[in-house]
Structure formats: C-alpha cells, structure tokens
Interface confidence: low
C-alpha cells in the first residue's frame, strides 16, 4: 500500500472553510492520479468529493462539489467549504495512481475537522 | 496519585466559551478541594485559574478570573470564557484534596481546547 500523510486535526474557519494537505509517497511518476475525500462519522464512511488529476492539467472537481484543490508533485492541497458544525468528523484522503500501471492505492489516517457554527450577526436597523 | 478524568477535545463556541467536566476518583469525602486549570502550549505551562471548594459553599474563582464552575460530588463543571484563537491549547485540570488529611493530588491528561476567531460582522449602514 502507498503511504498517504495528512494532518491529524484541522479547524474550519468561522466561514466553514477547512484546508489541509494530503501528501503521498509516489513509487513512480504517475500521469493520472485520482484523489477522493471520504468522511467517517459514527462508523459510517461517505464520499465527500473526488477528482482526477491529469499531468499538465488542473485538479478539477465537479462543479457542484464542496471541494477545490491544487496539485503540486505528490502534494494535494485540498479545501472543503460550506461546512457546518454537524459536518465535524474525520476526513480521509484516498489517493489512487491510475496510470501508468501498476495501480497503487493509499489511504491516509484521516484529518479530524472541527467546525463551529458562527453566532448570527445582530440585525442591522 | 489520584485519578483525574477530563475530555480529550472541546471546541470553544464562536463566542469564545469552552466548557468541560473534570472528574476525580476521590478516596474519601474531602471538605476542601482545590481545582486549578493549567494551560500547556509549546512545552510551557501557565496557570489559567484556580479555586477552592469548601463543602457546602460554591466553587468560587477570583472576580477577574476567566473561569467559572460548579461542583457536584467528585465532578467539577468548568467553563472558560473570553477565549481567542491564540488561546488554543491543552488545558489541564489539577485537583487537590486539601482537607482532611491525607493530601491527595491528581492531574488530568488535559483537554485540547480549539478556538476559532469569529468573522467580524459587516458594518450596518
């Protein structure tokens, strides 16, 4: 299995934005890399977002995705937005080297993202 | 040594208030208990607040203390207020059974308090 490193804890900003780096130890020069963010809460795992990086292009998530990211060699800078307190949980980075063969897969230990809902601003008169 | 339990992680509210329970395994019925909250950050330990509980009275911190608390048998409900992001750190609960003898002391493993500064509200026109 390929080693994937990610921070243990990240705090979302009061705007509900959390950023972290997912780094993998690549055994070779992959031209096609798939990155998936999974959320684990109450022993259930759900997919948050996924994107495929093609060498020379940008890391592109779907238009309605809550994730954005940039790719730099074997480091993926991930940003998740629109987070609420109820989204607090363990966010796991999964990296797959799709091409060229052989296929490699690595799964990080997860980043605990803490989210605090902001107090509403007082109404302006 | 006396066993002291406290939660591993607590999130401060967006108002900068964090609450947690500090529970100790008391070998007897102490009539005077001293509770101290210590903050550990960058290997430095500083005292945040301290109070002595006398059986039948309330747990009273100094007037200018950022801590408040209530006492219920061997459970201390602590609240720390006025926290900013820079106050993120490990908050350690120290409990001393002062009277009657013998003296017992217990130190918890600490509660990691995460604090996120709120976004300022937009100016009202």
């Amino acid at each position: 299995a390929m080693h994937v490193a990610q921070p243990a804890v990240v705090l979302a900003s009061s705007r509900g934005i959390a950023s972290f780096v997912c780094e993998y130890a690549s055994p070779g020069k992959a031209t096609e890399v798939r990155v998936t963010v999974l959320r684990q809460a109450d022993s259930q795992v759900t997919e948050v977002c996924a994107a495929t990086y093609m060498m020379g292009n940008e890391l592109t998530f779907l238009d309605d995705s809550i994730c954005t990211g940039t790719f730099n060699e074997s480091r993926v800078n991930l940003t998740i937005q629109g987070l609420r307190a109820m989204d607090t949980g363990l966010y796991i980075c999964k990296v797959e080297l799709m091409y060229p063969p052989p296929y490699y897969l690595g799964i990080g230990n997860g980043t605990q993202i803490y989210v605090i809902d902001p107090e509403p601003c007082p109404d302006s008169d | 040594a006396m066993h002291v339990a406290q939660p591993a992680v607590v999130l401060a509210s967006s108002r900068g208030i964090a609450s947690f329970v500090c529970e100790y395994a008391s070998p007897g019925k102490a009539t005077e208990v001293r509770v101290t909250v210590l903050r550990q950050a960058d290997s430095q330990v500083t005292e945040v607040c301290a109070a002595t509980y006398m059986m039948g009275n309330e747990l009273t911190f100094l007037d200018d203390s950022i801590c408040t608390g209530t006492f219920n048998e061997s459970r201390v409900n602590l609240t720390i207020q006025g926290l900013r992001a820079m106050d993120t750190g490990l908050y350690i609960c120290k409990v001393e059974l002062m009277y009657p003898p013998p003296y017992y002391l217990g130190i918890g493993n600490g509660t990691q308090i995460y604090v996120i500064d709120p976004e300022p509200c937009p100016d009202s026109d």
Epitope: - | A1, M2, H3, A25, S26, P27, G28, Y99, P100, P101, P102, Y103, Y104, L105, I107
Partner: antibody, heavy 125, light 107 residues
Framework: QVQLQESGPGLVKPSETLSLTCTVS????????LSWIRQPPGKGLEWIGY???????NFHPSLKSRVTISKDTSKNQFSLKLSSVTAADTAVYYC???????????????????WGQGTSVTVSS | DIQMTQSPSSLSASVGDRVTITCRAS??????LAWYQQKQGKAPKLLLY???NLQDGVPSRFSGSGSGTDYTLTISSLQPEDFATYFC?????????FGQGTKLEIK
C-alpha cells in the same frame, strides 16, 4: 534518628478504658501524622486510626465510637484511648509515623514509615 | 471499606530463590500501596511505598509492581534474613486496611 516508643499498662480489665502513650523523637509533631495499629496474637495488622499534625483525626469505622487519639506537642507525645474494652481488644499495639512521600511535585503517597516496637495489652479480669 | 487479599498465605522457599507475593484490592487504589516486613516479635518495617518505591535502606532485591487493583512484591534472590511475614496495606482513603499476611519460611 526517628524513634517511637509505646508505653502503657500490660493488663486492662474488661469494660475499662485502655490508655497508651507514644513518645516520639527525631521528627516534628507539627509536620507529620501518627497512626495507631494493633495486632491480635497470631493474627494480622489492623489500622486503628491516625492524628494529623493539625489535630485532625480519622478512625477505623468499627472502633470509631470507642477511640480517642490526641497529642501533646510540648511533650512529643501521642495518646490512644480505647473505651469499653473486651477480650477481643487483646493485642500488641503499635504507633507509627505516617509520612507523605512527594516527588515530581505532583503526587502525595502515604506509608507508615517508622514504627515503635509495640506494647502488649491483655484484656482480662 | 477496601478489602486487601494477599496470596499465598504461606510460602516455603530456599536461599537464592526468586519469590513473588501478590496483593489484590477490592477496588482501584491507584498505586497507594505499601509493603511491610515483620519478623517474629518485632514491629513491621516499611519496604516499599506507592507500590514501586523502595524505602531508604531497603536492599534492591526487593521490588514492587502493579497498578489498579493488582500488586506484586518480588524478592529477586532470597537471603537468610528475608524469612519473615510480609503485609501489604492500601492507603487510598481510610480505613487503611492490611492484607492478611504472607509467611515466608525456609524450605
């Protein structure tokens, strides 16, 4: 060096009060506690109670109603009084310095670190 | 009250043997345990306090271990002067009860 010496009558009549004295040297009565322990013939040890340096006392629940422990700092003496004695109170009576061992400035552990040689008391008419 | 159960109640061993005595508390005593040695007709002598700490002047062949409810006194290599009765005592709140004792005899 630390020394403790028990003294008192070797024979006490049933229903009377047993009075023993423990004379100490080599340590301060204002810093330590003193415990009384007894050992019936051919049996194990039974903790009777202690008096702390500040005069606070604590007794074995089964003897509480019959025991008084006091001290006379000026004479470096402690006394034990046990009222309404019966044959079951026949034993060797020991006094022992009760010490709190502190280390790492964190914990206080207790032990009976110095004992007198004991005085034999028989309850018989 | 916390009950202290010591085992074995008696033990035969030879000089040079390694001997282990155990003490079990009826509830967690958080290492607030002392071990004493008592020779015939003499007062008990403190060997170890806080479960593992050797009292000043006690030979290093004596050692203690354990936590929670289970504790052990070990004599690594028995000497002739070690044949005696051994008691454990908890000091986790009063009353400070003792184990019933282990009599260590020459085989």
């Amino acid at each position: 060096q630390v020394q403790l010496q028990e003294s008192g009558p070797g024979l006490v009549k049933p229903s009377e009060t047993l009075s023993l004295t423990c004379t100490v040297s080599g340590f301060s009565l204002t810093s330590y506690g003193l415990s009384w322990i007894r050992q019936p013939p051919g049996k194990g040890l039974e903790w009777i109670g202690y008096i702390w340096y500040d005069g606070n006392t604590n007794f074995h629940p089964s003897l509480k109603s019959r025991v008084t422990i006091s001290k006379d700092t000026s004479k470096n003496q402690f006394s034990l009084k046990l009222s309404s004695v019966t044959a079951a109170d026949t034993a060797v009576y020991y006094c022992a310095k009760t010490e709190g061992h502190y280390y790492g400035s964190n914990y206080g552990y207790y032990a009976l670190d110095y004992w007198g040689q004991g005085t034999s008391v028989t309850v018989s008419s | 009250d916390i009950q202290m159960t010591q085992s074995p109640s008696s033990l035969s061993a030879s000089v040079g043997d390694r001997v282990t005595i155990t003490c079990r508390a009826s509830e967690n005593i958080y290492s607030n345990l002392a071990w004493y040695q008592q020779k015939q007709g003499k007062a008990p002598k403190l060997l170890l306090y806080a479960a593992t700490n050797l009292q000043d002047g006690v030979p290093s062949r004596f050692s203690g271990s354990g936590s929670g409810t289970d504790y052990t006194l070990t004599i690594s290599s028995l000497q002739p002067e070690d044949f005696a009765t051994y008691f454990c005592q908890h000091l986790w709140g009063t009353p400070y009860t003792f184990g019933q004792g282990t009599k260590l005899e020459i085989k």
